[in-house]
């Protein structure tokens, strides 16, 4: 009559949780039985991120630190079931924690847009294209941002139109701009759950041009033309 190792009730164990669960939340549990009826002690192996703890008696698994989907999902650890007493035989299974993305990163500009300019005076309304991004995982659908002007007072001078889920066009509504810098506030909404909004500023300079670049006194950089 050979002593047998504990047997897990399932091939593997999985649990889906939101990445923003509170520390101390029960995120799953594992169960095993010992063929000889001995008690079982559970432990975890390979918890490299230090996110989890297991109740040695019940097999319940709890979070002990903030979870972050962007670190990679599913998060996989080994669970060990060991006989208490007897030959202390053990078995190994796996617990996979599937982290469901929480929309926790507001949209922002994809790059540095300083240095945008139009040659003054405008001969016709002008436009420029900009790109938004965020740091959430979009599960290969890609972000779907919507764009609007950040304040009502801007609507006399500017309009913003969506090109696709990440790009938009900022256009002047007329040609009567002063020779100075305008800061255009753009509201970007990510349409997530919950929806997050970022208000970004695009500084646009209207300046006298020499050979297609902003003329600046000595010591000032020439600006790149995004016309």
């Amino acid at each position: 009559d050979v002593n047998e190792a504990p047997q897990f009730s399932q091939h593997v164990f999985q649990a889906k949780v939101s990445e923003d669960v509170a520390i101390g939340t029960k995120v799953g549990n594992v169960t095993a039985k010992d063929p000889e009826g001995l008690d079982i002690s559970y432990s975890l192996r390979g918890d490299t991120r230090g996110w989890l703890k297991i109740d040695h008696v019940t097999g319940e698994i709890f979070s002990v630190a903030p979870l972050d989907r962007e670190a990679g999902s599913p998060y996989r650890v080994q669970v060990v079931a060991t006989e208490v007493g007897g030959s202390s035989l053990s078995s190994v299974s796996e617990f996979h924690l599937i982290l469901m993305d929480v929309n926790d990163n507001p949209p922002r500009l994809a790059k540095d847009y300083t240095g945008l300019f139009f040659c003054h005076p405008l001969s016709a309304p002008g436009s420029l294209i900009f790109e938004a991004t965020d740091d959430d995982q979009h599960l290969f659908r890609g972000p779907h941002f919507t764009f609007s002007l950040g304040s009502g007072s801007l609507q006399n001078d500017w309009e913003v139109s969506k090109i696709n889920g990440t790009h938009a066009r900022l256009s002047t509504r007329h040609t009567e701009f002063e020779e100075r810098e305008y800061v255009v506030l753009i509201r970007i909404n990510d349409g997530g759950r919950p929806p997050l909004e970022g208000i970004v500023s695009l500084p646009v300079t209207f300046c006298s041009c020499v050979e297609g670049s902003c003329f600046r006194p000595a010591g000032h950089k020439h600006h790149h033309h995004h016309h």
């Epitope: 091939h11 999985q14 599913p74 190994v92 599937i98």
Partner: antibody, heavy 116, light 107 residues
Framework: QVQLVQSGAEVKKPGASVKVSCKAS????????MHWMRQAPGQGQEWMGY????????EYNQKFKDRVTMTRDTSTSTVYMELSSLRSEDTAVYYC?????????WGQGTLVTVSS | DIQMTQSPSSLSASVGDRVTITCRAS??????LAWYQHKEGKSPKLLLY???VLADGVPSRFSGSGSGTDYTLTISSLQPEDFARYYC?????????FGQGTKLEIK
């Protein structure tokens, strides 16, 4: 990148044995269980069993329990599946696959033909 | 053993169509379910796991739903590269078993 490269096609006579290899690269070999499946002509996928490379623990489908042996060589990151007492109905494409939730990487398959 | 029954066994559709394949387990598998795409002469490709979670690199036109014993794979707008055979598979306990497959053909 993760790759599972299997040995080449085999032709065997009934009653013989075949040993198929699966060499893993691009990840920590000992960290993932390796499963074996097969697909006979015109049939669906059939699970044969798995090996845990870190512990050498194996579990087999009862259907193959007396005829299949899975082993591993950690020095070469290779797992092996040997099937004995071959019969014509063992003619199939044999696949190794890395276990996660489901099988996220598969070998290219090895055709084993059993014919007299 | 847990039996996995897929339907339909074959399906003809056109590019742009919405397609649904169902998979029924002989007992509760608690969303321990994966879906695969298998093209002739190639290895199977994991599409979804845990019934609803897209595997890395899989286009968002693929989605999964279901719980308990009944599960569904949906392709929202068929693309030419989607014509293949599709399998469900449970990984709840051994022996792991697959559905018999659904062959998706171009109409």
């Amino acid at each position: 990148q993760v790759q599972l490269v299997q040995s080449g096609a085999e032709v065997k006579k009934p009653g013989a044995s075949v040993k198929v290899s699966c060499k893993a690269s691009g990840y920590s070999f000992s960290s993932y269980w390796m499963h074996w499946m097969r697909q006979a002509p015109g049939q669906g996928q059939e699970w044969m069993g798995y090996i845990n490379p870190s512990t050498d623990y194996t579990e087999y489908n009862q259907k193959f329990k007396d005829r299949v042996t899975m082993t591993r060589d950690t020095s070469t990151s290779t797992v092996y599946m040997e099937l004995s007492s071959l019969r014509s109905e063992d003619t199939a494409v044999y696949y190794c696959a890395r276990s996660r939730l489901g099988f996220d990487y598969w070998g290219q398959g090895t055709l084993v033909t059993v014919s007299s | 053993d847990i039996q996995m029954t897929q339907s339909p066994s074959s399906l003809s559709a056109s590019v742009g169509d919405r397609v649904t394949i169902t998979c029924r387990a002989s007992e509760n598998i608690d969303s321990y379910l994966a879906w695969y795409q298998h093209k002739e002469g190639k290895s199977p490709k994991l599409l979804l796991y845990a019934a609803t979670v897209l595997a890395d690199g899989v286009p968002s036109r693929f989605s999964g739903s279901g719980s308990g014993t009944d599960y569904t794979l949906t392709i929202s707008s068929l693309q030419p590269e989607d014509f293949a055979r599709y399998y469900c598979q449970h990984y709840y306990r051994t022996p792991l078993t697959f559905g018999q497959g659904t062959k998706l053909e171009i109409k």
